[in-house]
């Protein structure tokens, strides 16, 4: 059984800090361990991952790590599975948020002597305590004109006056740590001497060497001052311009004009308004230089007539965002019709052959123009130049079947033979123009052939029947050397095929006629009783009208088939003695004898001193050893036939005679004693 040595336990954890849920397992076989969170398998990430059997957290996350963890151990071989106790985190965290206006509903409604309530959107666990600041100075609870409610995280000003104007921020702390507001609130209670925004500058994008204008206006009593600064805090005035802003002009109404803009002029411009009282107001606007990148290439497209297709033009990156349009034959495409532009797409509805050609996507902005062509081909259904014809092909020669078609794009041609796809191999070859070549025609190639020519627009097909004109040939060719058994009945077959059924006849090679006991029956030479005189050379002649004749020569030998006069017997020999395995065979031609021992032929020239094969065929083995035991086969063969017979040889230890046994006691089994 699977046993947990260490189980995960619930624990406190700090947001963003390390943690470890331990799990250790003991099992009889190898197990693999995985973790569940609320019943679903935990996927490894860089933040949370398996470390051995335990689950390691590089940075605890209060959202992703809330829930119940469980360690599961599985023996993959047996399928046994065990589950640990559940464990969860009590995650301590604090998270910054903005200071927002709670009352009144909008800044426009803030008037002197109204109540203003701000809320600090810092949250955490455990609940933090809050501290408020105005312009960085802490506000203590119970001070005149304001109250702090820690529970609601609110600061209330009653009544609010110009003296409360300022930047309000808050901080909060808990056992976990501290956080301050991510966005602060500027309270501006109307004071005529404070500068107020009338017109704020906007971001501008211009082409190189063009001009750019920023507008900026403030109002106050008495009138406020206005100053322009560039990124590096250099003031811009009509009297003192920085070196890279020689062509800058500040107008009396506060507008800033830049002429012949260069890349070094791009950046952030700040307009600062200062009233008699109150803080300065800083407004920012950015000057961007227009740019446009190159467009990606299009792949050529092949469409079919009658279909609807779209080609998307991805606009190049640029500032400002480039506008995109399509052209064909130098004419801009409309936004409706059969071939039109929709968004960045070229749309071709109910495609016609005439729609083929080059379409151009254009993109342009202040920085310039880019273009990219796409070549559109409209596929057509193939048409016939030459269909395959019913054909007569000669056996053994190459044969050709045409399948010539034309279309756009170039059609692909495949061939079928008896409804089976022909794959190119050593016998079949499909040329580029679609013609099929059969390299060496065989009889069974006579069947139906079908070619199919296809483009994306469709396909056409045609079939033709092939008739094979057979060669005049022997089927099979007679064996050139054959044996017949003396004094027995024998037959020698000869058959042939051709375009017309051939006639077959036998004759002796010397032209002499066949004896009366030898008959020629439809190509089979029949010997009623073989005599020595029947040996010799014979010719089989096959002929028909259109193809002439062919001849096959056969040499017939008359033989007395092999019989064994003496066969080897099952033999048991004492170790160290001599074994004799006798074998004698007769036949005509006189048979030769070979021995096979333990599955290998015994070569008389390599037998060594212990073994010898006599002239009469017997095998003798001297000083026999246990490893000589096994089956021995006597093989008798001549030019006409072969026969074999076998017997086992057993080599045994010589028994030690017991007291009771006399010297003349016979051995317990048949022995050769030497």
């Amino acid at each position: 059984a699977i046993v947990f040595i260490k189980q995960p336990s619930s624990q406190d954890a700090l947001q963003g800090r390390r943690a470890l849920l331990r799990c250790e397992v003991e099992a009889p076989g190898p197990v693999h361990v995985y973790w569940l969170l609320d019943g679903a398998p935990v996927q490894d990430t860089e933040r949370r991952f398996a470390q051995g059997s335990s689950l390691s957290f590089a940075a605890v996350d209060r959202l992703q790590d809330s829930g119940t963890f469980q360690c599961v151990a599985r023996d993959d071989v047996t399928g046994e599975e065990a589950r640990s106790a559940n464990a969860s985190f009590n995650i301590k965290w604090i998270e910054a948020g903005p200071v927002v206006l709670k009352h009144p509903a909008s800044e426009a409604e803030i008037q002197p002597q109204t109540q203003v309530t701000l809320r600090c959107h810092i949250d955490g666990h455990p609940r933090p305590t809050y501290q408020w600041f105005r312009d960085g100075t802490p506000l203590s609870d119970g001070q005149s004109n304001h109250t702090v409610s820690s529970k609601e995280r609110n600061l209330t000003l009653r009544p609010a006056g110009p003296e409360h104007s300022g930047l309000y921020s808050c901080c909060a702390h808990s056992a976990f740590g501290q956080a301050c507001s991510s966005q602060n609130f500027t309270l501006s209670i109307a004071d005529e001497s404070f500068a107020r925004v009338v017109l704020a500058p906007q971001d501008v994008v211009v082409a190189r060497y063009e001009e750019a204008m920023f507008h900026c206006q403030f109002s106050a009593q008495p009138p406020p001052s206005l100053q322009w600064l560039f990124e590096d805090e250099t003031p811009i005035t009509n009297r003192s311009r920085p070196p890279h802003l020689r062509r800058a002009t500040v107008f009396a109404n506060g507008s800033l004009l830049l002429t012949q803009v260069r890349p070094r002029n791009a950046g952030i411009y700040r307009c600062i308004g200062q009233g008699q009282r109150g803080p300065p107001i800083i407004l920012e606007a950015t000057l961007h230089l227009a740019e446009i990148e190159d467009m990606p290439l299009f792949e050529p497209r092949v469409f079919t007539a009658g279909s609807e297709e779209r080609v998307t033009c991805l606009p190049p990156k640029g500032l400002p965002e480039p506008s995109v349009w399509w052209e064909h034959a130098g004419v801009r495409l409309p936004t409706h019709g059969r071939v039109y532009q929709k968004g960045h797409e070229l749309v071709l509805a109910n495609i016609a052959e005439s729609d083929a050609g080059v379409y151009t996507c254009h993109a342009a902005n202040l920085a310039g123009q880019r273009r990219q062509d796409v070549n559109i081909t409209v596929a057509t259904v193939p048409s016939w130049l030459k269909k395959p014809q019913d054909s007569q092909l000669e056996e053994g020669k190459p044969g050709y079947l045409d399948c010539l078609t034309q279309a756009t794009p170039k059609p692909t041609v495949v061939w079928y033979r008896n409804q089976m796809l022909i794959s190119e191999d050593s016998r079949f070859e499909v040329f580029k123009n679609g013609t099929l070549r059969i390299n060496s025609v065989e009889v069974y190639d006579g069947t139906w052939y079908r070619c199919m020519s296809s483009t994306p627009a469709g396909s056409i097909e045609a079939q033709a029947r092939v008739q094979v004109l057979e060669k005049l040939k022997f089927t099979p060719p007679p064996q050139p050397q054959q044996c017949m058994e003396f004094d027995k009945e024998a037959t020698v077959p000869c058959s042939a095929t051709g375009r017309e059924k051939p006639t077959i006849k036998w004759e002796r090679a010397d032209g002499s006629s066949l004896p009366e006991w030898v008959t020629d029956n439809a190509g089979t030479l029949h010997f009623a009783r073989v005599t020595r005189d029947d040996a010799g050379n014979y010719t089989c002649i096959a002929s028909n009208g259109p193809q002439g004749q062919i001849r096959a020569h056969v040499q017939l030998t008359v033989a007395v088939f092999i019989t064994f006069k003496v066969e080897p017997e099952r033999t048991t020999v004492y170790q160290g003695h001599t074994a004799l395995l006798q074998c004698e065979a007769q036949g005509d031609p006189k048979p030769l004898i070979q021995w096979k021992g333990k599955d290998r032929i015994l070569d008389p020239t390599k037998l060594g001193p212990r073994m010898h094969i006599f002239q009469n065929g017997s095998l003798v083995i001297h000083d026999v050893a246990p490893e000589d035991s096994g089956r021995y086969t006597c093989i008798a063969g001549n030019s006409c036939n072969i026969k074999h017979t076998e017997a086992p040889l057993y080599v045994v230890d010589k028994p030690v005679p017991e007291e009771s046994e006399g010297p003349g006691s016979p051995p317990p089994y048949k022995m050769i004693q030497t």
Epitope: H32, D76, G79, A82, R83
Partner: antibody
Framework: EVQLVESGGGLVQPGGSLRLSCTAS????????MNWVRQAPGKGLEWVGI???????YYASWAKGRFTISRDTSKNTVYLQMNSLRAEDTAVYFC??????WGQGTLVTVSS | EIVMTQSPSTLSASVGDRVIITCQSS????????LAWYQQKPGKAPKLLIY???NLASGVPSRFSGSGSGAEFTLTISSLQPDDFATYYC??????????FGQGTKLTVL
């Protein structure tokens, strides 16, 4: 003796449903994971899904929605419910405990 | 979708040959080692040969061995025996209790 026996296979029409059973003996299902694996005629093995020791199920992407694995621990039996069957669902369906112990399989034929 | 690719799909060899079958996964298996090899003969259920990449299952001859890590694995038969002609499958286990088989390698007599 620990063994698994599948049953419930047979001929079903396309669009039809079938429920296969895998009855376990010699051990309790509640401590083991059980897999269903299928093999179309002349084709390779294809994992269908798994039910773990708690009864949670997980499936191959192609099996989600049509196939449902469940179990009845009192009967020590795991089930494979197959809906909207297609011709390509024709196969021998095996149940297996872990990697080692497999049933003999049951043939499902989907044909009209 | 996880794809496991075995190569070769078919393999002809002779008794005594050393045979290597490879298995490649489109993503890493769980723990980099959750991979098993099976042998299947016609009409029979698969038989487990190797689990956890390299551990020999009970009763499996030592001529079978496995190796690899992550997404690439091999099964080696050191000296092929007549009983080894069969189809072999790899099976990977993945994060999220998902498993997948290779398409199989048919080992036939040369």
């Amino acid at each position: 003796e620990v063994q698994l026996v599948e049953s419930g296979g047979g001929l079903v029409q396309p669009g039809g449903s079938l429920r296969l059973s895998c009855t376990a003996s010699g051990f309790s299902l509640s401590n083991y994971v059980m897999n269903w694996v299928r093999q179309a005629p002349g084709k390779g093995l294809e994992w269908v899904g798994i039910i773990d020791s708690s009864g949670s199920t997980y499936y191959a992407s192609w099996a989600k929605g049509r196939f449902t694995i469940s179990r009845d621990t009192s009967k020590n039996t795991v089930y494979l419910q197959m809906n909207s069957l297609r011709a390509e669902d024709t196969a021998v369906y095996f149940c297996a405990r872990g990697l080692y112990l497999w049933g003999q399989g049951t043939l499902v034929t989907v044909s009209s | 979708e996880i794809v496991m690719t075995q190569s070769p799909s078919t393999l002809s060899a002779s008794v005594g040959d050393r045979v290597i079958i490879t298995c490649q996964s489109s993503q890493s298996v769980y723990n980099n080692n959750l991979l098993a090899w099976y042998q299947q003969k016609p009409g029979k259920a698969p038989k487990l040969l190797i689990y956890h990449t390299s551990n020999l299952a009970s009763g499996v001859p030592s001529r079978f061995s496995g190796s690899g890590s992550g997404a690439e694995f091999t099964l080696t038969i050191s000296s092929l025996q007549p009983d080894d002609f069969a189809t072999y499958y790899c099976q990977g286990g993945y994060n999220g209790n998902i498993y997948a088989f290779g398409q199989g390698t048919k080992l036939t007599v040369l």
